[in-house]
């Protein structure tokens, strides 16, 4: 237990260089007073008093132990914390450090909530925006398309910057930037819709900085299951922020008497959060939590990073699987409320809708379900993975694969149930989304396993780019297109409006199954890619000058 406390403290953010250096010295076991025993998870190596960095690599969801060639492995001593308490080894305060890192993770998660809150506030007041600017549905759709496109383009750029420059400064600047732009956009006159479109594009750039860099900071603040937990909290911010965005949009509009005020809430909170990030988030070093000794060598070129990522099969397959999740969530989020409304029209429990938004009630229910299943999915995914890790080293991708394949079944059942029972359809949505969302944090986990710390921001960015490009950037349009295509070849009736959209949405479970296959493929290469990443980390670590190797 003492060792665990010590490990968690030592893995903390490097607020001060001296404390950091001190911790490194302690990790190497080089102090005379340490009596040849090393603390915090690193095994002491007889006589020599040197602990090689490649003995234990802490990843998101557990430490991976390996025995260095020619050296015997000595288990960590339960009383190792006490051994470190010599005059030459001042003990860091675990509680305060832990609290500091916890606060940092909380602030980063809050920032993620605000990112999504801002994104979906616009969705919550979309009808007002259309009426204010007098634009068509496609004009309103342009707001989301421009956002996603700029987000996609900006993500790799911020990935590059995030692996090379001060991350918390980039984060804060990103938040300040999108907050200022969103706030300004609430004052755009009705004749200048193109300015609103431009502003959403700029917001996409600002938010890309956050989404690509924040997870990597969490990755450097925590290890083992704590990192899984913190990333779970971070990714739960997605459904929470999205749901709150809808609610904020409509409720602020009601309370303030005008929809423009809805666009002024998240910027104010954003400015506060950006400031808190600057103050409370430590300037962690890349790979800080993964390193047990030494300093990371100079960074590689962006081109070399990209080549390495493209050759990393686990990364490529898990990114393709993430795209499948994105495809399904994008399409279902857009069309399920309307589909359920049409189902009710067929069942004669609702009137034919002549004035959208059709299925406004269904949108609210669906939003609430998404919010809750997001939380439930992240928690069950992390829990299932933790349990399965005791049985197999391939737990992460396998849990994701099972979740995806199970989700596909329940998504299929939505269309069966909707014909006769809306409640049944909602139950299928609930289970299907829970399973679908169960892989959010685990996918980030897989990335942290198979990608070296100095490439993580680039990896997150590229994964984000791919999942939007192949996923939610096109899926809502594609489903609408297929639905229209089916309707053109059938007679004009409420039944066929319902069926055509249902048949089009059937593409989602197929894509989800494909995503499950990609996760199974990830499982095939996972162990070898993880070993490669660990080996690369060791090669990247400069041995301490005072130690001969």
């Amino acid at each position: 237990m003492m060792c665990l406390e010590c490990a968690s403290a030592a893995a903390g953010g490097a607020e001060e260089e001296e404390a950091d250096a001190e911790r490194r010295r302690r990790r190497r076991g080089a102090q005379p007073g340490a009596g040849g025993s090393a603390c915090c998870g690193a095994r002491g190596v007889g006589g020599a008093g040197v602990v090689s960095a490649d003995e234990e690599v802490q990843t998101l969801s557990g430490s991976v132990r390996r025995v260095p060639s020619g050296l015997p492995s000595i288990p960590s001593t339960p009383g190792c914390a006490a051994a470190a308490k010599g005059p030459s080894a001042p003990q860091p305060k675990p509680a305060s450090l832990g609290r500091g890192r916890g606060a940092a993770a909380a602030i980063l998660s809050l920032g993620n909530v605000l990112n999504y809150l801002d994104r979906y506030t616009v969705a919550g007041v979309l009808l007002d925006i259309q009426q204010h600017f007098g634009v068509k549905d496609r004009g309103a759709g342009l707001l989301q398309s421009v956002f996603i496109c700029s987000f996609m383009v900006a993500a790799p750029i911020f990935g590059y910057l995030g692996d090379r420059f001060n991350r918390k400064v980039i984060l804060s600047c990103g938040i300040f930037f999108w907050s200022a732009v969103t706030f300004s956009s609430s004052f755009i006159p009705q004749q200048y819709f193109w300015l609103l479109v431009l502003s959403r594009g700029l917001v996409g750039i600002g938010e890309a900085s956050y989404s690509t860099i924040a997870p990597t900071i969490i990755g450097d603040l925590f290890t083992k299951n704590t990192r899984t937990l913190m990333l779970s909290v971070f990714y739960f911010a997605i459904p929470l922020g999205s749901g709150l965005g809808y609610i904020t949009g409509s409720s602020v509009k009601q309370a303030a008497g005008d929809w423009h005020w809805a666009l002024r809430v998240s910027p104010v909170l954003g400015m506060i959060t950006g400031t808190l990030i600057l103050i409370l988030v430590p300037a962690t070093k890349r790979g800080h939590a993964d390193q047990l000794g030494g300093q990371l060598k100079a960074r590689t070129s962006w081109l070399r990073d990209m080549k390495a990522l493209i050759r990393n099969r686990s990364y490529v397959f898990s990114s393709l699987a993430t795209s499948a999740v994105s495809f399904a969530t994008g399409a279902l989020g857009m069309w399920i409320p309307l589909y359920l409304h049409r189902a009710q029209v067929v069942q004669k429990t609702a009137e034919t809708c002549n004035s959208p938004p059709c299925g406004a009630k269904d949108s609210l229910i669906f939003g609430a379900i998404t919010c809750f299943t997001g939380f439930l999915g992240v928690v069950t995914g992390a829990g299932a993975t933790r349990w399965c890790r005791l049985r197999t080293q391939r737990a992460d991708p396998l849990v994701c694969a099972v979740g995806m394949l199970g989700s596909a079944i329940f998504i299929c059942l939505i269309f069966v149930a909707a014909k006769t029972s809306i409640v049944g359809a909602y139950i299928c949505i609930f289970v299907g989304e829970t399973l679908l969302f169960s892989n959010w944090a685990i996918t980030a986990d897989i990335l942290m396993y198979v990608v070296i710390p100095t490439r993580r921001a680039t990896a997150v960015a590229l994964q984000s780019f791919t999942s939007h490009l192949l996923g939610d950037a096109g899926s809502p349009y594609l489903i609408g297109f297929i639905s229209d295509l089916i309707r053109q070849s059938t007679k004009d009736s409420p039944l066929w409006e319902f069926l055509s959209l249902g048949y089009a949405l059937m593409l989602c479970p197929f894509v989800v199954v494909l995503g499950g296959m990609f996760f199974l493929a990830t499982a095939l290469f996972f162990l070898s890619d993880r070993a490669k990443a660990e080996q690369q980390v060791n090669q990247l670590v400069m041995p301490p000058a005072s130690v001969k190797v």
Partner: antibody, heavy 115, light 110 residues
Framework: EVHLVESGGGLVQPGRSMKLSCTAS????????MAWVRQAPTKGLEWVAS????????YYRDSVKGRFTISRDNTGNTLYLQMDSLRSEDTATYYC????????WGQGVMVTVSS | QFVLTQPNSVSTNLGSTVKLSCRRS????????VNWYRQHEGRSPTTMIY?????PDGVPNRFSGSIDRSSNSALLTINNVRPEDEAYYFC?????????FGGGTKLTVL
């Protein structure tokens, strides 16, 4: 079913004031921008004023700016048009309208400005 | 701000097809929705087409709306014209929250 019912029209002298009301039913009133449209005898339709969902933003045609005030009461599902400093050219049938999505019109109320 | 121009009057024969046009003076006709209203003498307007091409319930499928990008116009097509179609037809579009109306076309059925 959507219903818009105007009231408050009649004969008024130039320079005087008049207030028109429009009671809405059959749809979520506070989701929609609303407008007043008028039609002078033997003339076409002419937009007069419109108001945002919460009433915070109002728009007027140049000829009525500063004289007419559009407002709404979302709790009572009612739209208003306060007309001050009326002129003879304001004589028309005034329609309350929801012009977004599927537009709906009231039956209209006649306002005659004459001495 | 743009202007919507409609022909003052159009005459057509009973049972034939007629196209009523509504030309936008500046900006793309496709940028904003176009609605079409019919008004019989002494009555309030009723919506015949909204959102460019959508028919409300109760409007016969003889009526259809379309956008002609080449002439930057919206078109209201009435097939198999009937005596009750004789009325004024107004087109309307949006410039932000300002509603722009065409001058109206008087359709006469011969």
């Amino acid at each position: 079913e959507v219903h818009l019912v105007e009231s408050g029209g009649g004969l008024v002298q130039p320079g005087r004031s008049m207030k028109l009301s429009c009671t809405a039913s059959g749809f979520t009133f506070n989701n929609y921008y609303m407008a007043w449209v008028r039609q002078a005898p033997t003339k076409g339709l002419e937009w007069v004023a419109s108001i945002s969902t919460g009433g915070g933003y109002t728009y007027y045609r140049d000829s009525v700016k500063g004289r007419f005030t559009i407002s709404r009461d979302n709790t009572g599902n009612t739209l208003y048009l306060q007309m001050d400093s009326l002129r003879s050219e304001d004589t028309a049938t005034y329609y309350c309208a929801r012009c977004w999505e599927l537009p709906y019109w009231g039956q209209g109320v006649m306002v005659t400005v004459s001495s | 701000q743009f202007v919507l121009t409609q022909p003052n009057s159009v005459s057509t024969n009973l049972g034939s097809t007629v196209k009523l046009s509504c030309r936008r003076s500046s900006g793309n006709i496709g940028n904003n929705y176009v609605n079409w209203y019919r008004q019989h003498e002494g009555r309030s307007p009723t919506t015949m087409i909204y959102r460019d091409d959508t028919r409300p319930d109760g409007v016969p499928n003889r009526f259809s709306g379309s956008i002609d990008r080449s002439s930057n116009s919206a078109l209201l097509t009435i097939n198999n014209v009937r005596p009750e179609d004789e009325a004024y037809y107004f087109c309307q579009s949006y410039s932000g929250s300002i509603y722009i109306f065409g001058g109206g076309t008087k359709l006469t059925v011969l």
